[in-house]
Amino acid sequence: IWELEKDVYVVELDWHPDAPGEMVVLTCHTPEEDDITWTSAQSSEVLGSGKTLTIQVKEFGDAGQYTCHKGGKVLSRSLLLIHKKEDGIWSTDILKEQKESKNKIFLKCEAKNYSGRFTCWWLTAISTDLKFSVKSSRGFSDPQGVTCGAVTLSAERVRVDNRDYKKYTVECQEGSACPSAEESLPIEVVVDAIHKLKYENYTSSFFIRDIIKPDPPTNLQLKPLKNSRHVEVSWEYPDTWSTPHSYFSLTFCIQAQGKNNREKKDRLCVDKTSAKVVCHKDAKIRVQARDRYYSSSWSDWASVSCSGSGSSRGGSGSGGSGGGGSKLRAVPEGSSPAWIQGQQLSQKLCTLVWSAHPPMGHVDLPREEGDGETTSDVPRIQCGDGCDPQGLKDNSQFCLQRIHQGLVFYEKLLGSDIFTGEPSLLPDGPVGQLHANLLGLRQLLQPEGHHWETEQTPSPSPSQPWQRLLLRLKILRSLQAFVAVAARVFAHGAATLSPGSGSGLNDIFEAQKIEWHEHHHHHHHHHH
C-alpha cells in the first residue's frame, strides 16, 4: 500500500483466486483515544472501533472511503483504491490500447517543434467516474522539470473497431529545454488513471526528436507557368516550427492527387519551399513536411486545388506568412567552401545513418549489462557546447571540436569488432558507406597534420552475435541523433557564416594550435 495523495491510498493486489487479500491497517488521525468508531462509504454500519481498523482488501467491495468518527463528528477519512496485478502484469482496463506497433502503447505524444513543448493523448471508452493526473520529467534519477497542464477532454470522438472512444489530451513543457542539444535522457510521462475505485498508471518514455511532427506547410500557392502544363507550387514553413529555419530545416514532399482523392504514386521531395509540378484541372496538389535531418513523423498534408486559385491547408496547419529565412539559396554567396562541404557531407551522413537503421516507430531497445559503457560514454552535443545558432555565431570552434570528438568516436565504433564481427555486414553496404563518410567529415574538420586529443575511446565489444546486433542498433540510434545536430550546424554555418566573420572552417584551422589545446583542457564536459 502506498499514498497517492493526502488520505488517498493505493492497495496493490495480486488479482488471482489463490492470492490472499492485502491486510490494511487504517489509522484515525486524531489525538482522541476513546469512543472512536469506523464506517465505510459502502455502509453506515459500524465496522469497528478504536484508533485503528484492520481490514482485508481483496475485492473492489473492500476499497472506497473509510471514515472514523467520535460522537457523530468525522475525525478523518481514508480513500482506498485498488491497483490490480494479473499474472504479474498491472491491469490496463481504463485506457484503450493504440495498436500502432509491437509494443503496447496507450499514450501517444507529439511535438510540433524542438522547444520542449509536447502534447500527449489517450483514448478511453469510459465516460463517468474518471480522473486523470499527469507527471513528467526528463530522466528518472535526478529528474529535470517538465510541467504539464490540466488534462482536457477533447471534443473529438475517435472511432475504433465500431466503438466510440473519448480522447483526453495534456500539454507539457520542459522547463529548461535545449532545442539544439542532442538529447541523452528521455522524457518520462506518467498518467495516473482512476476509474471509480480502480487505479492504473500508464507511462511513456521518449526523446523529443522521436515525437516531432511538424504542422503542415502554410500559405500553399500555385503559380501557373507560361506555355507549360506545369505550375510552380510554393509554401512556407509552419509558424509553429523551430527557428531559425537555416538551422532547424525541413524537407518537403509534394504529391499530385487525382479526382476522388486517388493518390498518384510519384512523390517529389525537395528541401526548398517551392517546386514545379504538373497540375491537371481536377487534381489537387498536396505538400507535407518533415525534419530534414532526422526521420521523425511527416506532417499532415496541406493541399491546394489545381482548378481554384489561392491557397488552402490541411490538418492542423495554421495560417500566416511565417517561414522567415526559409527561402535560402542552396549555396549563399560568400559562405565558406568548407562549411558547404560540411553541409553536404553531414546531410549525406543523415541519409546513410537512416538507411543503415530505418525508423522503427518507438521501440525501446533492452538494456544489457555492460553495454552502457559503449553507449553511455558517447560524446553527445550538449547545451553548453555552442552548437546552437547563437553559439555558432559567437564562436563555432567549441561546437566543431565537439562534433570532431563525436566523429572520431563513432568512426572508431564503426570500425570496431561490434560492426566488423559476426553477423557480418557488406563492406559496401550502408554501414560501410557511413564509416567512409564519417571519415570524410572528420578529415574536413581535422586536416592532415592537425591532431586534436579525444577524450573517449570505445569499450571492448560484446562476445555474442545477438549482443553485437543489439549494440549496433543502439549505436546507430545514437548516431542518428548526433549527425542530425551536426547537419544542422553545418547547414546553418553554410547559410549564415561568411569568411569575413572569422567563423569559417578555413579560418578555424588557421587559428593557433595552442588555442585548441588549451580549450580542450579547460573546457571539459560532463556526459550523461
Epitope: P17, D18, M23, S43, E45, T54, Q56, E59
Partner: antibody, heavy 119, light 107 residues
C-alpha cells in the same frame, strides 16, 4: 434492519435446473457482495461463491464452476443462484449471505431455501 | 483449497462451563478467520471475525484468538442458548472454506 429474504422450497427432477432468489433490504444492496452457501442434510457448510451486485464480478468455488450461475437484478435488489443438471447429491438448504466490506466473512444470512431432487 | 479442521467434532458441557473449540488451517491464513453459530433449522449467525473481533450484538462471553494456522473460540460461561453447532471459516484465499463443525450439547 438488514434482511435477506429467500424464495420458497423447491422440488425438482434430476437433470433439471433450479433458480433460488434472495432479496436484500435495510442496506445499500449494490455496495455489498452476496454469497451462496449450501448445507446438505446433516452436513456442514459449503461455500459456493460470491458476486458483486454492482458489476456482476463473480468468484465461484471450483467444485461448483460450470454447474452454478449467479446473477443479480439491482432494480429489485435481488440476487439469484441457478443450479443446473440437478442430481440427488444437490439436495440441500441453500443460503444467501452478505459479505462484510473490508473482510470476507458473511455478516448476515438469508433464512435458507430447501431444494429437493426427486424423480 | 485450504482445509479447515475443527476439534472436537462434538462435546458435552454444562451451563456455566468454560468451553474451547479449536480450528486448524492447512496453511497460514493470517487472521482472516470467522466463527459462526448455527441452531437446528436456522441460518448460521456470525459471532467472531478477523479471528478475535466480536460481531456487533454478540455477548462478550464469546471470544476468539489465534493467527496463522491455529485458532480458538472460547465461551467463558456457557448459557442455555449457546448449545448449537459452531463453524469456523477462512476468508484468506478463495474458495472460502468452512470447518466441518463442532456440535456443542448439554451434558
Amino acid at each position: 434492519e438488514v434482511q435477506l429474504v429467500q424464495s420458497g422450497a423447491e422440488v425438482k427432477k434430476p437433470g433439471a435446473s433450479v433458480k433460488v432468489s434472495c432479496k436484500g433490504s435495510g442496506y445499500s444492496f449494490t455496495t455489498y457482495w452476496l454469497g451462496w452457501v449450501r448445507q446438505a442434510p446433516g452436513a456442514g457448510l459449503d461455500w459456493m461463491g460470491i458476486m458483486s451486485p454492482v458489476d456482476s464480478d463473480i468468484r465461484y468455488a471450483g467444485k461448483f464452476q460450470g454447474q452454478v450461475t449467479m446473477s443479480v437484478d439491482t432494480s429489485t435488489s435481488t440476487a439469484y443462484m441457478e443450479l443446473s443438471s440437478l442430481r440427488a447429491g444437490d439436495i440441500a438448504v441453500y443460503y444467501c449471505a452478505r459479505r462484510r466490506p473490508g473482510q470476507g466473512y458473511f455478516d448476515f444470512w438469508g433464512q435458507g431455501t430447501l431444494v429437493t431432487v426427486s424423480s | 483449497d485450504i482445509q479447515m479442521t475443527q476439534s472436537p467434532s462434538s462435546l458435552s458441557a454444562s451451563v456455566g462451563d468454560r468451553v474451547t473449540i479449536t480450528c486448524r488451517a492447512s496453511q497460514g491464513i493470517s487472521s482472516w478467520l470467522a466463527w459462526y453459530q448455527q441452531k437446528p433449522e436456522k441460518a448460521p449467525k456470525s459471532l467472531i471475525y478477523a479471528a478475535s473481533s466480536l460481531q456487533s450484538g454478540v455477548p462478550s462471553r464469546f471470544s476468539g484468538s489465534g493467527s496463522g494456522t491455529d485458532f480458538t473460540l472460547t465461551i467463558s460461561s456457557l448459557q442455555p442458548e449457546d448449545f448449537a453447532t459452531y463453524y469456523c471459516q477462512q476468508y484468506n484465499i478463495y474458495p472460502y472454506t468452512f470447518g466441518q463443525g463442532t456440535k456443542l450439547e448439554i451434558k
